[in-house]
């Protein structure tokens, strides 16, 4: 079956500079502002649009060693970012795959909200339930905060 | 046990040049930034700059922009700050510090190179 | 940029007073604040990052609090080894002027 998940989680920073900087320019930000959750991404296959194959080692702070994605689509006008994790202990015995969509929009008040839909697939007849997807969840929500402290610091980049 | 140790005290005359470093250990050093403070005598703590080792990416606090070179070489788990001329205004305590992981508090802390600039 | 500024510079106090020392933000900084204690001659040290997480080993008497561009330092029943200066800082970024705690 397939099991959904949704997560909506505030910003300060503005749309684009937010898309630009976690989405198109994550791989190379999130390691350095968030170092015991991911140590590196670093591109098996592809160059960054879809297709690609991305092998992202957790750090430290992790139960989880690794997890490859592959990359869905990128929608710089729209701040929409698609992919999928294909492997990784991160899926266990339970889960074939999970497709990740992000979309930054404009929050009324100043600054924006990233949503994160989430399609867990299980294997078989296997149940998943919230708890078990919740993880996705908090890790989404500590790198977004990881990142918005850098540009709050360094507001001359990614604008 | 996370560990920074910096380089001994220095005496210079203004004009001079100085590199000063700050040694990391008992961590993955290239991973997490660092940062170097000034605190001059009897005053508060200012952040100069950080560096990332991992790629050598640094970043200067406005006011110290042209004023120090901060530099990194993870191959020896080394950060430095250097001077190409000593001024008077620069003898202070320079600390080096680790930004964790979590938000970036320099959770561990170099014990501070004194450096006196004087003719 | 941002500016930290801190408040009072300087208080005289007893052992076991409550001592409140806050810190503002130019704009807005989340809760993306930590507080340090110096004592003289030592280099800094992290008590609180993140606005109200304490760093590890850090006795619970110190506390923080605040977000957006309010924060408070409190220090529940000041100890001897309390008396030092402190400071908050904006991650990676500036420190406030700093706060003397002196002994009355």
């Known amino acids: 079956g397939v099991f959904n998940y949704e997560v909506e989680t505030p910003s300060v920073i503005p749309a684009a500079r937010l898309f630009k900087s976690y989405v198109l320019d994550g791989d190379k930000l999130i390691p350095k502002v968030a170092p015991q959750a991911i140590t590196s991404v670093e591109n098996v296959e592809g160059n960054g649009g879809p297709g690609t194959i991305k092998n992202i080692t957790f750090g430290e702070g992790s139960r989880y060693k690794y997890v490859k994605e592959r990359v869905d689509e990128v929608d710089n006008t729209n701040f929409t970012y698609s992919y999928t994790v294909i492997e990784g202990d991160v899926l266990g015995d339970k889960l074939e795959k999970v497709c990740h969509e992000l979309k930054i929009v404009a929050a009324p008040g100043g600054g924006s909200i990233l949503k994160i839909s989430s399609k867990f697939h299980a294997k078989g007849d296997h149940e998943i339930n919230a708890e078990e997807m919740k993880g996705a969840k908090e890790m989404a929500e500590k790198l977004l905060r990881a990142v918005e402290t850098y540009l709050l610091a360094h507001s001359a980049e990614y604008n | 046990e996370v560990q920074l140790v910096q380089s001994g005290a220095e005496v210079k005359k203004p004009g001079d040049s100085l590199k000063i470093s700050c040694k990391g250990s008992?961590?993955?050093?290239?991973?997490?930034?660092i940062g170097w403070v000034r605190q001059m005598p009897g005053k508060g703590l200012e952040l100069m700059g950080i560096v990332y080792p991992g790629d050598s990416d640094t970043k200067y606090r406005p006011s110290f922009l042209g004023q120090v070179t901060i530099s990194a070489d993870k191959s020896i788990a080394t950060a430095f700050l250097q001077w190409s001329r000593l001024t008077a205004s620069d003898t202070a305590i320079y600390y080096c510090a680790r930004l964790g992981a979590t938000y970036a508090g320099a959770d561990f802390w170099g014990q501070g190179t004194l450096v006196t600039v004087s003719s | 940029d941002i500016q930290m500024t801190q408040s009072p510079s300087s208080l005289s106090a007893s052992v076991g007073d409550r001592v409140t020392i806050t810190c503002r933000a130019s704009?807005?900084?989340?809760?993306?604040l930590n507080w340090y204690q110096q004592k003289p001659g030592k280099a800094p040290k992290l008590l609180i990052y993140a606005a109200s997480n304490l760093q590890s080993g850090v006795p619970s008497r110190f506390s923080g609090s605040g977000s957006g561009t309010d924060f408070t330092l409190t220090i529940s029943s000041l100890q001897p080894e309390d008396f030092a200066i402190y400071y908050c800082q904006q991650s990676y970024a500036a420190f406030g002027e700093g706060t003397k705690v002196e002994i009355k």
């Open positions: 704009q807005t900084i989340v809760t993306y």
């Open positions: 008992g961590y993955s050093f290239s991973n997490f930034w």
